[in-house]
Amino acid sequence: YDFTNCDFQKIEADYLRTISKDLITYMSGTKSTDFNNTVSCSNRPHCLTEIQSLTFNPTPRCASLAKEMFARKTKATLALWCPGYSETQINATQAMKKARKSKVTTNKCLEQVSQLLGLWRRFIRTLLKQQGSSDYKDDDDKHHHHHH
């Protein structure tokens, strides 16, 4: 899917409002230092590409993330703010139905969600990164919003 068409600000707001809380709940009981971040992203569309892949593509060691609450909310957010996204997700839905029904949270799933948290942190630029910052604000920075 081509994430260059998404409304990044709206996705940011949805993440901060709901998805982040569900990811943190999933990770409760683990420390942020328990896992090394090995997956990264280099710009906002690329971050969404990696987030989509880690959230919805089942892996042999962690097949059930797509059924989690944060994944459902992620899917809803992308469908809402990325034009045409929901039409591309038929195959992903089939994979979700085939995913294991057990609710066992494996260490590998925890590691994968830790990676997801890291990717989301990279995606979030304009809201979190400016809080308490003494840097310049974006008031006169037209480029920041010019493709929405």
Partner: antibody, heavy 117, light 107 residues
Framework: EVQLVQSGAEVKKPGASVKVSCKAS????????MHWVKQAPGQGLEWMGM????????TLIQKFKDKVTLTVDKSTSTAYMELSSLRSEDTAVYYC??????????WGQGTTVTVSS | DIQMTQSPSSLSASVGDRVTITCRAS??????LAWYQQKPGKSPQLLVY???TLAEGVPSRFSGSVSGTQFTLTISSLQPEDFATYYC?????????FGGGTKVEIK
């Protein structure tokens, strides 16, 4: 007004090091990734790597991993690129450029590094 | 790594001509592509991003399009200030790569 102002031209001897600065103003420094691009004389543009000023995470392409160090100073909104063990093939113009969504909307004016014995 | 093959490497044209520059990606990069113009001794300037969105302040004679893995920059009517070198650049993950450049010269 958004500006990326780079340090002046440098002439260095082989084996030496050089540190190029890129001072950002007019926007929130930590919001945008900062990238570095090399342009050898008469050649095209070559992507070297990037740094996320918010946490200093860097990515460098393989050929520059032992050559380049990227750093930032958030207090002065400045990005730095250090080239070590300089050789003649490091002679080039080096640009900093910022990005949020993958395209470079602002570039520095470029810093010429000349390596000559 | 994704390779960007840009063609032609140079072309001669006259003021008023329609000029087309192409860039082919070695794999699918969706719309993760930008075009830049560079004049001698100057920094590159953004022309087009996300394959077909015109950057702020860029004249409407410039346009970008995409078909599969082939990207096109078109100048509908070449102006004297358009004689320069043009580069494409993908940003579909790292490493980012540029095309080899197209030098547009006066015929």
């Amino acid at each position: 007004e958004v500006q990326l102002v780079q340090s002046g031209a440098e002439v260095k001897k082989p084996g030496a090091s050089v540190k190029v600065s890129c001072k950002a103003s007019g926007y929130t420094f930590t919001t945008y990734w900062m990238h570095w691009v090399k342009q050898a004389p008469g050649q095209g543009l070559e992507w070297m790597g990037m740094i996320d000023p918010s946490d200093s995470e860097t990515t460098l392409i393989q050929k520059f991993k032992d050559k380049v160090t990227l750093t930032v100073d958030k207090s002065t909104s400045t990005a730095y690129m250090e080239l070590s063990s300089l050789r003649s093939e490091d002679t080039a113009v080096y640009y900093c450029a910022r990005t949020l969504d993958g395209y470079y909307d602002y570039w520095g004016q470029g810093t010429t590094v000349t390596v000559s014995s | 790594d994704i390779q960007m093959t840009q063609s032609p490497s140079s072309l001669s044209a006259s003021v008023g001509d329609r000029v087309t520059i192409t860039c082919r990606a070695s794999e699918n990069i969706y719309s993760y592509l930008a075009w830049y113009q560079q004049k001698p001794g100057k920094s590159p300037q953004l022309l087009v991003y996300f394959a077909k969105t015109l950057a702020e302040g860029v004249p409407s004679r410039f346009s970008g399009s995409v078909s599969g893995t082939q990207f096109t920059l078109t100048i509908s009517s070449l102006q004297p200030e358009d004689f320069a070198t043009y580069y494409c650049q993908h940003h579909y993950g790292t490493p980012w790569t540029f095309g080899g450049g197209t030098k547009v010269e006066i015929k």
